[in-house]
């Protein structure tokens, strides 16, 4: 495995007071392997609400690299290939669980964390507010 | 805490051979709170590729209940509110980390697992295969 410079303040795994702590096996089982999902790899270009993917890296987090979607346009692409501003491209957001090293630099002490990521974009009809 | 009928084969937290195992604090930290509060969207109804949410439950997993997106139509909704089959509604999929009790019924031994979930749908131009 990876050797991490150890923080001298790392909690002791045997410490019965280590808060709300459980053992987690990081030998990640991938439930997706047999399902053969249709990969959504080129949807970001083919969508009427296309998006770009931006890399977000944090070495103290697992997974360290998360790709975030950013919609390319405010509007959506119409049949002529032009941006139609009567519709809106919006990000579909999702919370994901990640593990954060805590305290930092401790090789085998983590905290569960929820972060919000944008997964892709969809085209929606706008909400029009009528001013009285 | 919770009292769980204990599996006699539960691993010993102090066992140095427990594979690739780390201590995880389950006091879930919410990174979103100060920066980006989550907004429960109605995009699943307003999208040109609308979707329904379907319940998937597995009591040995956290989160035990996952609501998955299923696109309502093969095509996309056009400006007249009709389904246009010249375009395709497709699911945007994302891998998420979940925790699985392993061995089952062990109160504080878990395994990380990756599962693929459909988060929402987007409208894409179809790939047309021309037969020679």
């Amino acid at each position: 495995g990876i050797t991490i410079p150890r923080n001298p303040g790392c909690p002791n795994s045997e410490d019965k007071n280590f808060p709300r702590t459980v053992m987690v096996n990081l030998n990640i089982h991938n439930r997706n392997t047999n399902t053969n999902p249709k990969r959504s790899s080129d949807y970001y270009n083919r969508s009427t609400s296309p998006w770009n993917l931006h890399r977000n890296e944090d070495p103290e987090r697992y997974p360290s690299v998360i790709w975030e979607a950013k919609c390319r346009h405010l509007g959506c692409i119409n049949a002529d290939g032009n941006v139609d501003y009567h519709m809106n491209s919006v990000p579909i957001q999702q919370e994901i669980l990640v593990l954060r090293r805590e305290p930092p630099h401790c090789p085998n002490s983590f905290r569960l964390e929820k972060i919000l990521v944008s997964v892709g974009c969809t085209c929606v009809t706008p909400i029009v507010h009528h001013v009285a | 805490g919770i009292t769980i009928p204990r599996n006699p084969g539960c691993p010993n937290s102090e066992d140095k051979n427990f594979p690739r195992t780390v201590m995880v604090n389950l006091n879930i930290h919410n990174r979103n709170t100060n920066t980006n509060p989550k907004r429960s969207s109605d995009y699943y109804n307003r999208s040109t590729s609308p979707w329904n949410l379907h319940r998937n439950e597995d009591p040995e997993r956290y989160p035990s209940v996952i609501w998955e997106a299923k696109c309502r139509h093969l095509g996309c909704i056009n400006a007249d509110g009709n389904v246009d089959y010249h375009m395709n509604s497709v699911p945007i999929q994302q891998e998420i980390l979940v925790l699985r009790r392993e061995p089952p019924h062990c109160p504080n031994s878990f395994r990380l697992e990756k599962i693929l979930v459909s988060v929402g749908c987007t409208c894409v131009t179809p790939i047309v295969h021309h037969v020679a």
Partner: antibody, heavy 126, light 107 residues
Amino acid sequence: EVQLVQSGAEVKKPGESVKVSCKASGGSFRSYGIGWVRQAPGQGLEWMGGITNFFGVEDYAQKFQGRVTITADESTTTAYMELSGLTSDDTAVYYCARDPNEFWNGYYATHDFDYWGQGTTVTVSS
Amino acid sequence: EIVLTQSPDFQSVTPKEKVTITCRASQDIGSELHWYQQKPDQSPKLLIKYASHSGSGVPSRFSGSGSGTDFTLTINSLEAEDAATYYCHQSYNLPITFGQGTKVDIK
């Protein structure tokens, strides 16, 4: 259909403790959490704390920290709330409520209470 | 602690009338705002979760809207059985907090 059935009314003296039970049926007990909310006579709702059954992790409101203990027993699908050092201010109806703990519409949905117990009246009087 | 302030505290309404109750949060809570109905001597019942999504078996006359700090519960055509106290509740941050309640009675 989820149902939460609470233990009966209690009369206690100041300084004593009370333990209220909440028996859950319907759905998988492990899949959700249980929150505890109280309501003093003629007053509003006040959150005391809760437990995530999957992990056995509790959260407490600071006001009750050190005085309240929330536990759950998966074998009997029952959650418990014990409040110690009772005073007349603790006279209230105590409710347990189901916290779905679902991954819903892209989010980890917690602390939105979708089913409630019938309430347990606790009277503290000397 | 996030403070939720409901208005009005009390509303007396005739049947078939439209009722609007507002809930203001002391900070941005996204959409993590829920509404409950409590009838006298009964437990609270979930009406609306996450600002605008109906709880199971809730009549369509109940709807919710809002995001951020300002939220609204609307009862479109009040029925006699809707006489109750309505509470908003935020799940954005611990401690979970509730509004002080709005009592709705029938004229």
